[in-house]
């Protein structure tokens, strides 16, 4: 029997290497059965996750999954950091793993580095 618990499909220790000035969509895949839960995004500040208010978000529906999307229009250097989505379901809070955005400022990089370089050259990243 398929579980009817809400599940949030963000991989543990996932990350995205992105560039300041570009648009970016951060997706939180949500599985639910009958009623779509209320989902929010927060950004980690140490051990506290600060809810993101007044940001552009949207839903995208696919066959077996819905996606709660946080829009970056455009990405700013200050968007660097870790994010988590949470679902409010039957008065319980379900939290996703955090996912990290590594933002490169294209002004300080002569050319866009590869994904592998992004992971291995932290001096290119904002901390």
């Amino acid at each position: 029997k398929e579980s009817c618990d809400v599940q949030l499909y963000i991989k543990r220790q996932s990350y995205h290497s992105i560039f300041a000035g570009d648009p970016f969509k951060l997706e939180c895949p949500v599985k639910y059965c009958a009623h779509r839960p209320q989902v929010t995004w927060c950004k980690l500040n140490g051990t506290t996750c600060v809810k993101l208010e007044g940001r552009h978000t949207s839903w995208k529906q696919e066959k077996n999954l819905s996606f709660f999307i946080l829009h970056f229009e455009p990405v700013l250097p200050s968007d660097n950091g870790s994010y988590r989505c949470s679902a409010n379901f039957l008065s319980a809070i379900i939290e996703s793993h955090s996912t990290t955005l590594y933002v490169t400022d294209v002004k300080s990089a002569s050319e866009r580095p590869s994904k592998d370089e992004m992971a291995s050259r932290p001096w290119l990243l904002y901390s």
Partner: antibody, heavy 119, light 112 residues
């Protein structure tokens, strides 16, 4: 049932390159992380690196950076390990493994493929 | 890198014995989500390793209940409550909290 089959091992001369393949079945690899571990004869386990097949992002142990490249083809459910500038000390059984990226609910290893670096 | 130190390196025991293997990490394995990503593997000669335990104490499906894991922070143990003939193998701990992933050097469990 999740299963992995490795291929591509064998005898290779020092200084040459080799590409190992790891074919997964029973799982959508985009929901997983796939990683490579090696074991020299009679020795312990050494983590080479991993890939997120959903986006191609990789992580490596420092000693393998620049010499090892892990890649994946989600549509074919295959992960690859390319090793360049092989040395005799790279002789080992190379294992690929896969685990659930969301809940760690499974972690399955392939049978391993022996790479012998010798002239 | 996190160093993983297992003890003992080898161990002789008899069928029916209770056996404990310890694993110590050079820094805490407690992740930001409050979980410790410590795994135990079993490897038999000529075979691939097989995960027995993950998240310190969760048993993989099909693993007999005589295996158990415990610990927190930097100190972890694998216990086999009553050794069976098929349990003679090499056991490895490894951490999945930080990159790069690192393994203990292994504990070879032999028949006395």
């Amino acid at each position: 049932e999740v299963q992995l089959v490795e291929s591509g091992g064998g005898l290779v001369q020092p200084g040459r390159s080799l590409r190992l393949s790891c074919t997964a079945s029973g799982v959508n690899i985009k929901d997983t992380y796939m990683y490579w571990v090696r074991q020299a004869p009679g020795k312990g386990l050494e983590w080479v690196g991993r890939i997120d097949p959903a986006n191609g992002y990789t992580r490596y142990t420092a000693s393998f950076k620049g010499r090892a490249t892990i890649s994946a083809d989600g549509s074919k459910s295959i992960a690859y390990l390319q090793m360049n500038s092989l040395k005799t000390e790279d002789t080992a059984v190379y294992y690929c493994a896969v685990y659930d990226g969301y809940y760690e609910s499974f972690d399955v290893w392939g049978q391993g493929t022996l790479v012998t670096v010798s002239s | 890198d996190i160093q993983m130190t297992q003890s003992p390196s080898s161990l002789s025991a008899s069928v029916g014995d209770r056996v404990t293997i310890t694993c110590r990490s050079s820094q805490s394995l407690l992740d930001s989500d409050g979980k410790s990503y410590l795994n135990w593997l079993q490897q038999k000669p000529g075979k691939a390793p097989k995960r027995l335990i993950y998240l310190v104490s969760k048993l993989d499906s099909g693993v007999p209940s005589r295996f158990s894991g415990s610990g927190s922070g930097t100190d972890f143990t694998l216990t086999i409550s009553s050794l069976q003939p098929e349990d003679f193998a090499t056991y490895y701990c490894w951490q999945g909290t930080l990159f790069p992933r690192t393994f203990g050097q292994g504990t070879k469990l032999e028949i006395k």
